[in-house]
């Protein structure tokens, strides 16, 4: 009886494994064995795939052979007894356009609050993904395991922190990779959960913004209690692309090791252009705050992006805000050639009750404010521009008394 | 294979200096950082400091700063262990340790025994 | 600096049996604990980083567990060779403190 060629072959590529399944396209006959020849572009030769011959069951692995990834190839297999079927020819492809990115490694930490995620390419030294290293970037899903309500995080590299979340809490989550240069969505880790600790003593630093005054940055957070010292770490942002290690060599700031004040100045040369993250650590001596939200700091938008300037008119009703140009030292104004949008908090000095305005415009009118009442005014401003969506620091606050009622106009 | 060898054992009189060496094989220390721990005969393992040998930061536990200097030669691979004004409480096995991933004590060197005597 | 507290120095297991060992830290540390193994005459081997990680290569009798303050490394059956001391570290904040040991004997 004459064999009938297998059928219906699929070719599976996952990171640097190669599967290759095939329906048997007779059931009936025992006892048969499967073989796969290869075909590079350009040549006329067929060669036996090592790891695929004489294969009993219908699946196989090739991940041994050392294939140009980026190199078209062509298969084709045969069943075999004392016999042989004709071969059948698989269509061909490019094993890097139809690889698929495995699961990522995941390895968590916990704090009180928050959790910390290192993930890792699946596959290590992937020959597969040997020149997109790199361009690896990854999403998320996590839960409450108690609630089961999702929250998704896109866009975010081999290491990230997840903050604001309740201590002595289980959260679960899923890490999956992507190469959106090449449109690729890889497959979901599987779930990974850690319960947040018991809350801290101390609690992190919080609000942290850096200014720009004179030659010196300054760096401010706040701080729940007194008589504390503050540290303050930096890390160069791309580090937290790297994909293998996981080693942060966050660098101290020399005028920022054990400050008893809730900010710290140091010179703009103690850091090169570039982006960094800074992030601050309380200590009261005997115990220690877990590290502070981390903030993106880029020196090219620090430079330049300053808080502005106002001036307010008091009517009865309503304040008139003059915006105007930020200074410089020497109080020469900083000439800022790109639009900006500026927002304007302002509330009653005796409430915590903010309000706040978004204006393009330089003149911005406060509207419906109450007669011979204090109000107080900060302002920032931010870039409109979507690739340098930055922010300035706010303003000192502005505090001004509002005139007597029906005030001409 | 990552290795890391220490120099061997030294007799030093008191007051004297010393200087340990580690050299590593199988990684490059400027990706890493390398500590130096201390452990003496019947008692604990106590850390020294360490350095990032990329840039020689280095960071020393409280009770080390004045009597330890720890340095690194990037081109030959090694960290160093300099003691100074030795006493009989320096007399310990002394380890070079790289601190790999997430910042833990991933390999060991073999330890080297410091005897201080006069 | 933190404190890491191992209080039994000493314990005493059978072949086959399963140990604890415990480590307390004087403050929250999150999950930022390791365990090392010291046979006699030899360097200290990492067996398990971020309170529950095991290194490749340590067997899977090996357990960490814990987090904050307690902290537990659980020998699901132990054997022979498991002869050692072991010692707890805390990898939060420097210097990295190491916990003052326990001596495993086996009867």
């Known amino acids: 009886k004459n064999l009938k060629s297998p059928q219906k072959v699929e070719v599976d590529i996952i990171d640097d494994n190669f599967i290759l399944r095939w329906n048997r396209s007779d059931e009936s006959v025992g006892n048969v064995t499967f073989s796969f020849d290869y075909q590079k572009t350009g040549m006329d030769n067929w060669i036996k795939l090592s790891g695929c011959q004489n294969i009993t069951s219908t699946k196989c692995n090739f991940s041994s052979l050392k294939l140009n990834v980026y190199e078209e190839i062509k298969l084709r297999i045969r069943a075999e007894k004392e016999n042989t079927s004709s071969w059948y020819e698989v269509d061909s492809f490019t094993p890097f356009r139809k690889a698929q990115i495995g699961p990522p490694e995941v390895h968590l930490e916990a704090e009180d609050k928050a959790i910390v995620i290192h993930i890792s390419p699946g596959t290590k030294d992937s020959v597969m993904w040997a020149l997109d290293g790199l361009s690896f970037t990854y999403s998320l899903v996590i839960w409450k395991n108690s609630s089961g309500v999702e929250e998704r995080i896109e866009n975010i590299y081999s290491r990230h922190k997840i903050y604001k979340l309740s201590p002595e809490t289980t959260y679960c989550l899923k890490v999956k990779a992507a190469l959106l240069t090449s449109w690729k969505i890889g497959v979901y880790s599987p779930v990974h959960c850690i319960k947040t600790t018991v809350e801290n003593e101390l609690p992190p630093p919080e609000n942290i913004e850096v200014s720009v005054q004179n030659q010196n940055y300054v760096l401010k957070w706040d701080y729940t209690y007194a008589n504390m010292t503050f540290q303050v770490q930096w890390l160069h942002a791309f580090l937290k692309r790297n994909p293998g290690n996981h080693l942060y060599k966050w660098k101290q700031i020399p005028d920022c090791e054990n400050v008893k004040t809730t900010q710290c100045v140091f010179p703009q040369n103690v850091f090169q252009k570039g982006i960094y993250l800074l992030r601050v650590q309380a200590s009261d001596g005997n115990n220690t705050s877990f590290w502070s939200e981390e903030i993106k700091f880029d020196t090219e938008i620090q430079a330049f992006l300053l808080p502005p300037v106002f001036n307010i008119r008091s009517l009865s009703d309503s304040f008139h805000i003059y915006i105007g140009a930020p200074k410089q030292s020497g109080n020469t104004p900083v000439i800022q050639d790109y639009p900006l949008i500026y927002e304007i908090i302002f509330w009653e000095n005796t409430s915590n009750a903010e309000r706040k305005i978004i204006e393009k415009k330089t003149d911005v009118t406060v509207p419906n404010l109450k007669p011979l009442t204090v109000y107080c005014v900060k302002a920032r401003a931010h870039t409109m521009d979507e690739k340098l969506n930055k922010s300035s620091v706010f303003s000192d606050a502005v505090c001004e008394k509002t005139k007597p009622g029906n005030t001409s106009k | 294979e990552v290795q890391l060898q220490q120099s061997g054992a030294e007799l030093v009189k008191p007051g004297a200096s010393v200087k340990l060496s580690c050299t590593a094989s199988?990684?490059?220390?400027?990706?890493?950082?390398m500590h130096w721990v201390k452990q003496r005969t019947e008692q604990g393992l106590e850390l020294i400091g360490r350095?990032?040998?990329?840039?020689?930061?280095?960071k020393y536990a409280p009770k080390f700063q004045v009597k330890a200097t720890i340095t690194a030669d990037a081109s030959s691979n090694t960290a160093y262990l300099q003691f100074s004004s030795l006493t009989s409480e320096d007399a310990a096995v002394y380890y070079c340790?790289?601190?790999?991933?997430?910042?833990?004590?991933?390999?060991w060197g073999q330890g080297t025994t410091l005897t201080v005597s006069s | 600096d933190i404190v890491m507290t191992q209080s039994q120095k000493f314990m005493s297991t059978s072949v086959g049996d399963r140990v604890s060992v415990t480590c307390k830290a004087s403050?929250?540390?999150?999950?930022?604990v390791a365990w090392y193994q010291q046979k006699p005459g030899q360097s200290p081997k990492a067996l398990v980083y971020?309170?529950?990680y095991r290194y490749s290569g340590v067997p899977d009798r090996f357990t960490g567990s814990g987090s904050g303050t307690d902290f537990t490394l659980t020998i699901s059956d132990v054997q022979s060779e498991d002869l050692a001391e072991y010692f707890c570290?805390?990898?939060?904040?420097?210097?990295?403190?190491f916990g003052g040991g326990t001596k495993l004997e086996i009867k």
């Open positions: 340790v790289r601190g790999g991933n997430f910042y833990y004590f991933d390999f």
């Open positions: 199988g990684f490059n220390i400027k990706d890493y950082y």
């Open positions: 350095i990032d040998p990329e840039d020689g930061e280095t």
């Open positions: 403050q929250n540390v999150g999950t930022n």
């Open positions: 971020s309170a529950s």
């Open positions: 570290q805390q990898c939060i904040n420097y210097p990295y403190t």
